[in-house]
């Protein structure tokens, strides 16, 4: 386990010509904040893909209002560090994505609106513990300097956070059961990761992947009793004076979850898991608000008005996680048919079909189209031996010759309004209720349901479908 | 081809009625839209007067006209504005409109002139 | 809700930029519900922009809408003598009401 750290130093426009002046202008004053997004691996992953090693959320910077006779200057920047926690082992090679967002702070309807003003995406090998490492990146007219590092967080060290060290409990000597951890002088070693199954209450082991039982136990991962004994559930290194195995430190000694978390044990580590309100690696992290903007990937934040009231993040379809950061496998159903290769591109789903075979699922056979014809944009689609036409948007029938109404399902939830424009269904709520199908009151049992940010939904904002 | 037509205008005396008829071709009220009645007075800009939602039959009215103007749905491409009361500053082009979405006039009829003189 | 453009009239030079202003007393719906058009003599107004920025179909780029919530922008950059026209914006606001702004007549020289 550990935190990746980093620190933006300045964001404003490049040089030449052509560069902005201002990321707010004639849109009143605004603001800046960051978003950071961390993925495992070298490789060109979608934009979408989620952020597998984490991320996080800045806060919002000064407010900036453009005077128009000075020069561009670099923007005022939010205080502080970004960090994100990583549970696992820090992968050495990964992708790190920025992205700068504008808020906007004239009237709008329901509070601020959102933009993103600019991404950079670096693919880096970075070992855990090493120096800070400077970079300046070029987005659009854009350019952002910054330094990061990856750092362990005790009971881990080393390059990839995979050892697990706690510092000494006296100065000469490391506690029951730990050994200094070379070449570390000032932390000891932890017991090895035993054998996968071994009993975490019946087991121990001296090298990893062995399995050793207390007196009492046997079998391959000791959860075989034998027979009774004083010792009998004790685990830890032998006492010399009673020749029982004694109790050693688990991860969970001491509980390290703040805030009321609760901790479980995970092979050589732990896992908190933190009341609402708290998050990160040992709910830490708290007074969060939805004004944090803490749901990623369109979620919808609710309550959590101010820091002593936990917020709930509404997830969009594709997203689950307290704050809407895991995306779920959707192309796990194997949804395309006839080999079709599956694409989860996060607001869609996708296949690409083999040769031979289309629509939205490779569901058709295209053979059986030849000479027909579809009106108003429709496709032929293969039907057992017979075509039928996939139609457009707006057009329904067996060529597509009807008129189809996009809303006819109801789609817009209390008593929004359904229109059927031509780039899709399109919703506009009554008052009181916001989202692209107005699923959401505004003031729930007095409640505000803020949006989260970045980009989030306003009350009463439509989207397109 | 899409289009809107509007009819029903004419010469009119103050206090007198008058009921304009909007007719779609192309399109049906099948589909979810708001039916909408702007005017326009001789060298102003457009006035929205009143829409009538397909999808249901909900209708919205500017709060100057209401009371005064009724507007309805007569049949699946028709759409009616019943006026009344008249007076001389009602005077306009009438022109039928459709909102298919984003709260903007995609679609216009030519306009029909009503004039209200004694 | 009231929709207020300015300046009018506008005049510009062919091949010239014109700006052209248009405040509302609230916010539009979802921020963004605010359209452009353009009306001729004996003719309905035509629209060139809707939901703020978005292009209709058929309308050239030089065509430009921008702004948020209560203040919007309409922008025609490289003027043709065909844009001499009068310019109105307008709203849709929550509750289903619908306002027009009062027109900019734009003279291409």
């Known amino acids: 386990a550990g935190v990746f750290e980093l620190q933006i130093h300045s964001f404003g426009p490049g040089p030449g010509p052509g560069a902005p002046r201002s990321p707010c202008s004639a849109r009143g004053p605004c603001r800046l904040f960051f978003r950071v997004c961390l993925k495992p691996g070298l490789s060109e992953e979608a934009a979408e893909s989620p952020c597998a090693l984490g991320a996080a959320l800045s806060a919002r910077g000064p407010v900036y209002t453009e005077q128009p006779e000075a020069p561009a200057p670099d923007l005022p920047l939010p205080n502080g560090l970004l960090q994100v926690p990583f549970r696992d082992a820090w992968p050495g090679t990964f992708s790190l994505i920025i992205e700068t967002w504008r808020e906007e702070l004239g009237d709008q309807i329901g509070g601020p609106a959102w933009s993103l003003l600019a991404r950079v995406t670096r693919r880096r090998r970075l070992a855990a513990g090493g120096p800070w490492a400077r970079d300046i990146q070029r987005a659009g007219a854009w350019e952002l300097r910054f330094s990061y590092r990856a750092r362990c967080e005790l009971p881990a060290v080393g390059t990839a956070c995979t050892r697990l060290c706690r510092p000494r409990s006296a100065p000469s000597r490391c506690g029951p059961g730990l050994r200094p951890c070379a070449p570390l002088e000032d932390e000891c070693e932890a017991p090895p990761v035993c054998r996968a199954g071994c009993s975490l209450e019946h087991g121990f082991c001296e090298q990893p992947g062995e399995c050793r039982c207390l007196e009492g136990w046997t079998g391959p991962l000791c959860t075989v009793p034998a027979s009774t004994s004083s010792c009998l559930g004790l685990r830890g290194p032998s006492s010399a004076t009673t020749g029982c195995l004694v109790p050693g430190p688990g991860p969970c000694d001491g509980n390290p979850c703040a805030n009321g978390g609760s901790c479980s044990e995970t092979p050589g580590s732990f896992e908190c898991t933190c009341p609402r309100g708290f998050y990160g690696l040992r709910c830490e992290v708290s007074g969060v608000t939805c004004a944090d903007g803490p749901c990623f990937n369109g979620g919808l934040c609710v309550g959590g008005a101010d820091p002593d009231s936990a917020y709930i993040c509404h997830c969009p379809p594709g997203f689950q996680g307290s704050n809407c950061e895991k995306r779920v496998d959707r192309c796990s159903l194997q949804p395309c048919r006839n080999g079709g290769l599956c694409l989860d591109l996060g607001h869609a789903l996708r296949c690409r079909c083999r040769a031979g075979f289309a629509g939205p699922r490779c569901e058709h056979n295209l053979d059986d189209c030849a000479g027909r014809a579809c009106a108003n944009g429709g496709t032929c689609v293969e039907g057992g031996g017979a075509h039928r036409c996939s139609c457009a948007l707006g057009f329904g029938g067996r060529d597509c010759r009807e008129r189809a109404d996009p809303c006819a399902a109801r789609p817009c939830a209390h008593g929004g309004r359904c229109y059927a424009h031509f780039s899709g269904l399109v919703c506009a709520c009554a008052p009181g209720y916001m989202g692209s199908r107005c699923e959401f009151p505004v003031h729930p049992d007095g409640v505000s349901a803020l949006p989260a940010a970045p980009p989030g939904l306003r009350p009463g904002d439509p989207q397109r479908h | 081809q899409e289009q809107l037509v509007e009819s029903g205008g004419g010469l009119v005396q103050p206090e007198g009625s008058l009921t304009l008829t909007c007719t779609a071709s192309g399109f049906s009220f099948s589909s979810s839209y708001d039916m909408c009645w702007v005017r326009q007075a001789p060298g102003k800009g457009p006035e929205w007067i009143a829409c009538?939602?397909?999808?249901?039959?909900?209708t919205d009215y500017a709060s100057w006209a209401k009371g005064r103007f009724t507007v309805s749905k007569a049949s699946s491409t028709t759409v009616t504005l019943q006026m009344t009361s008249l007076a001389v500053a009602d005077t306009a082009t009438y022109f039928c409109a459709r909102n298919s979405g984003y709260g903007y006039f995609g679609l216009w009829g030519p306009g029909t002139l009503v004039t209200v003189s004694s | 809700q009231v929709l207020t453009q300015t300046p009018s009239p506008v005049s510009a030079a062919v091949g010239g930029t014109v700006t052209i202003s248009c405040q509302s007393t609230?916010?539009?719906?979802?921020?963004?519900?605010l359209s452009w058009y353009q009306q001729k003599p004996g003719q309905p107004p035509k629209v060139l922009i809707y939901q703020a920025s978005n292009l209709e179909i058929g309308v050239p780029s030089r065509f430009k809408g921008s702004g948020s919530g209560t203040q919007f922008t309409l922008t025609i950059s490289g003027a043709q003598c065909d844009d001499a026209a009068t310019y109105y914006c307008q709203g849709y606001y929550s509750g289903y009401i619908y306002a027009f702004g009062g027109g900019t007549e734009v003279v291409v020289k």
């Open positions: 009538i939602y397909t999808g249901d039959g909900s």
């Open positions: 609230e916010s539009v719906y979802g921020s963004d519900w």
